[in-house]
């Protein structure tokens, strides 16, 4: 017979990341007979769902089905029809839903129930919707970046697949920033931990990993901003808040009811003599930085070393991949280059925050004003969190790599989540197969 390549048996998987500010659908594919190899799964599509995060649908659950339609239909187009019924679909909700659950378990359950019913209407193998824990979010993010960087592979490559990839098998730490929480996950030098709550043990591809992880709820960039506003309005003499974290000339009216809607501002809540206040930007990085630092309680630490709020943090070790909003914000500010020192980043932030709002709007005409207005705060917050929160220094700054994608796949928890739920990360190193996946007959 003629030498003819057999068609590759490809499998697909779908993960929906139901974040606090929006939902994204990711489609992954991999060769079926190589599913236990490291690095073979890759992302083929990301579809961003139009609208806010699912927690915002608590009063309009009947709209959830329509909200998810476009991206689910996109999945039907991308994935071959013959694969639909065996393609698993997972939805993981993160800190936005954790916060809603804190307010009302019943409301959170109702949202998830409607999400589940909507997703089960599609011709895929729907495997459920759940609120993942902060620990899972951190762990799966760590698995994702190290899987994509080839850190679990026993075969040492002579080439690098990404500029910051080192040939050693030392894993990267993971720094994830969302709208409502932030995660730090890495393998510390010392195997013993002072805080069992922050310790995870994995056996992946025949190797044991003792991992530190923590998720700081309410310390995502959006909730951190709400916290800062709630803290600062306490000491405002009237309904005007002169805010150094917004550009000079920027003005915005905030409803006090919106400010106190989130559980994250409860500690700052007080009876105010007004229903609304106006933010007036003054654009001062240094003052903004000082205001942000007040969100981190560093006065109390029951361990040898803490991050903030009394949470154990071992000494930082190795390289870190900083992704999600760490990347989006720093990329917008053009500060993701390996060559940009921490001092230079601070300098650039000072300059950016001090630019007048009218000038900023002109320079970035294509960017939605809501997002554009918050980059000064977000950039300042990222610097404060990394330097004062996690204790990176000017020297260790160069070990932080701001990552959007690795090999075409987004850095984030979704890939790790799917790899785990589809049992594609074996505990032991798989025996290498003699045939490649293009077999000839």
């Amino acid at each position: 017979t003629q030498n003819k390549a057999l068609p590759e048996n490809i499998k697909y998987g779908i993960v929906l990341d139901a974040g606090s500010s929006h939902t994204s659908l990711y489609i992954y594919k991999w060769p079926a007979e190589k599913e236990n190899d490291t690095g073979v799964v890759h992302q083929v599509e990301e579809c961003r769902v139009k609208g806010p995060g699912i927690s915002k649908y608590v009063q309009k659950v009947n709209e959830i089905g329509i909200y998810l339609t476009d991206c689910m239909e996109r999945a039907r187009e991308v994935i071959p029809r013959s694969q639909h019924q065996e393609t698993p679909v997972y939805l993981g909700a993160t800190a936005g839903m954790r916060l809603l659950r804190m307010e009302s378990e019943e409301l959170a359950d109702r949202v998830l129930d409607v999400v589940e019913r909507s997703l089960s209407n599609y011709p895929f193998d729907f495997q459920g919707a759940r609120i993942i824990t902060g620990q899972e979010e951190g762990a799966y993010g760590w698995i994702t970046i190290n899987y994509l960087l080839g850190k679990f592979s026993q075969k040492t490559r002579w080439f690098s697949i990404v500029p910051y990839e080192t040939n050693n098998q030392e894993t990267f730490g993971a720094l994830d920033l969302g709208g409502a929480s932030t995660q730090i996950t890495f393998v510390p030098q010392n195997q013993t931990t002072e805080s069992p709550d922050n310790a995870l043990q994995f056996r992946l591809y025949g190797k044991d990993y003792n991992v530190y992880t923590h998720s700081f709820l309410c310390y995502g960039k959006d909730q951190a901003l709400w916290q800062k506003l709630a803290k600062d309005i306490q000491v405002a003499s009237n309904e005007i808040l002169r805010d150094p974290c917004f550009h000079p000339g920027y003005k915005k009216v905030v409803n006090v009811s919106d400010l106190y809607k989130t559980p994250c501002t409860k500690r700052f809540e007080m009876t105010l003599p007004f229903q609304q206040f106006e933010i007036q930007g003054i654009g001062n990085y240094q003052q903004c930085h000082q205001s942000v630092l007040e969100l981190f309680n560093t006065s109390y630490c029951p361990y040898s070393q803490c991050a903030f709020n009394g949470i154990f943090l071992p000494p930082l070790q190795g390289d870190f991949g900083a992704f999600s909003a760490f990347y989006f914000v720093m990329n917008f500010l053009n500060l993701t280059s390996e060559k940009v020192s921490q001092e230079k980043v601070t300098e650039m932030m000072k300059k950016f925050c001090s630019q007048p709002w009218e000038e900023i709007k002109t320079s970035y005409a294509g960017v939605k004003e809501k997002y554009l207005s918050e980059y000064c705060f977000s950039g300042t917050y990222i610097l404060s969190l990394l330097l004062q929160g996690y204790h990176f220094t000017a020297d260790s700054w160069e070990h932080i790599h701001f990552i959007g994608k690795i090999q075409g796949s987004d850095a984030g928890w979704t890939l790790g989540y799917m790899l785990n739920l589809t049992n594609m990360i074996p505990a032991e190193q798989p025996l290498s197969t003699p045939l490649s996946h293009s077999t000839y007959v």
Epitope: R81, Q85, P123, F126
Partner: antibody, heavy 121, light 107 residues
Framework: EVKLEESGGGLVQPGGSMKLSCVAS????????MNWVRQSPEKGLEWVAE??????????HYAESVKGRFTISRDDSKNNVYLQMNNLRPEDTGIYYC????????????WGAGTTVTVSS | DIVMTQSPAILSVTPGDRVSLSCRAS??????LHWYQQKSHESPRLLIK???QSISGIPSRFSGSGSGSNFTLSINSVEPEDVGVYFC?????????FGAGTKLELR
């Protein structure tokens, strides 16, 4: 030979209950979504219910007109699919077909001969 | 729900005629449209899947076309045994819905 055979139809009073059964043969029953479709002169062909696989946690879907009254279930060990019909109404009268899709989904390439349900006082 | 509208309701034909049956969906369903034939006192039988894909065992005179919301079932040269009712079906999303049918009869 691929075959579906329905049973359990008959005459029932409004408000009454009835359970339809369908036995499958000639294919690996546990691997396929199963459906019930009904037909009446008044409403024509009408999809009634679907049940998916064990791996899909036996997920079920129903037409709005039967939701809360009808229950589809399956027994993979017996190659059987069932339709439990409660609180029956005259408009539920018709021929009930057991159907499946051996090739992909949401069309019906295998139909049973049907069983007639009459709801009347 | 997606409403399927078929026309004409009745079609009188002569053997050998080429006929076209129409089906319209109330919203776009891509090519998720299936056609069935039902002869008197029989169960429906699948004729065409996904708007235009033929089914093994179905005579080649039956063909389908269309995409989005407008679809056509064509019978190249009608045979006497083609008499019956033809239904189209939305296979795009739940609830699955059928058209009311087109009755094909001999003139």
């Amino acid at each position: 030979e691929v075959k579906l055979e329905e049973s359990g139809g008959g005459l029932v009073q409004p408000g009454g209950s009835m359970k339809l059964s369908c036995v499958a043969s000639g294919f690996t029953f546990s691997k396929y979504w199963m459906n019930w479709v009904r037909q009446s002169p008044e409403k024509g062909l009408e999809w009634v219910a679907e049940i998916r696989l064990k791996s899909n946690k036996y997920g079920t879907h129903y037409a709005e007109s039967v939701k809360g009254r009808f229950t589809i279930s399956r027994d993979d060990s017996k190659n059987n699919v069932y339709l439990q019909m409660n609180n029956l109404r005259p408009e539920d009268t018709g021929i009930y077909y057991c159907t499946t899709q051996l090739d992909l989904y949401w069309f019906f390439d295998v139909w049973g001969a049907g069983t007639t349900v009459t709801v009347s006082s | 729900d997606i409403v399927m509208t078929q026309s004409p309701a009745i079609l009188s034909v002569t053997p050998g005629d080429r006929v076209s049956l129409s089906c319209r969906a109330s919203q776009s369903i891509s090519d998720y449209l299936h056609w069935y034939q039902q002869k008197s006192h029989e169960s429906p039988r699948l004729l065409i899947k996904y708007a235009s894909q033929s089914i093994s065992g179905i005579p080649s005179r039956f063909s389908g076309s269309g995409s989005g919301s407008n679809f056509t079932l064509s019978i190249n040269s009608v045979e006497p045994e083609d008499v019956g009712v033809y239904f189209c079906q939305n296979g795009h999303s739940l609830p699955l819905t059928f058209g009311a049918g087109t009755k094909l009869e001999l003139r």
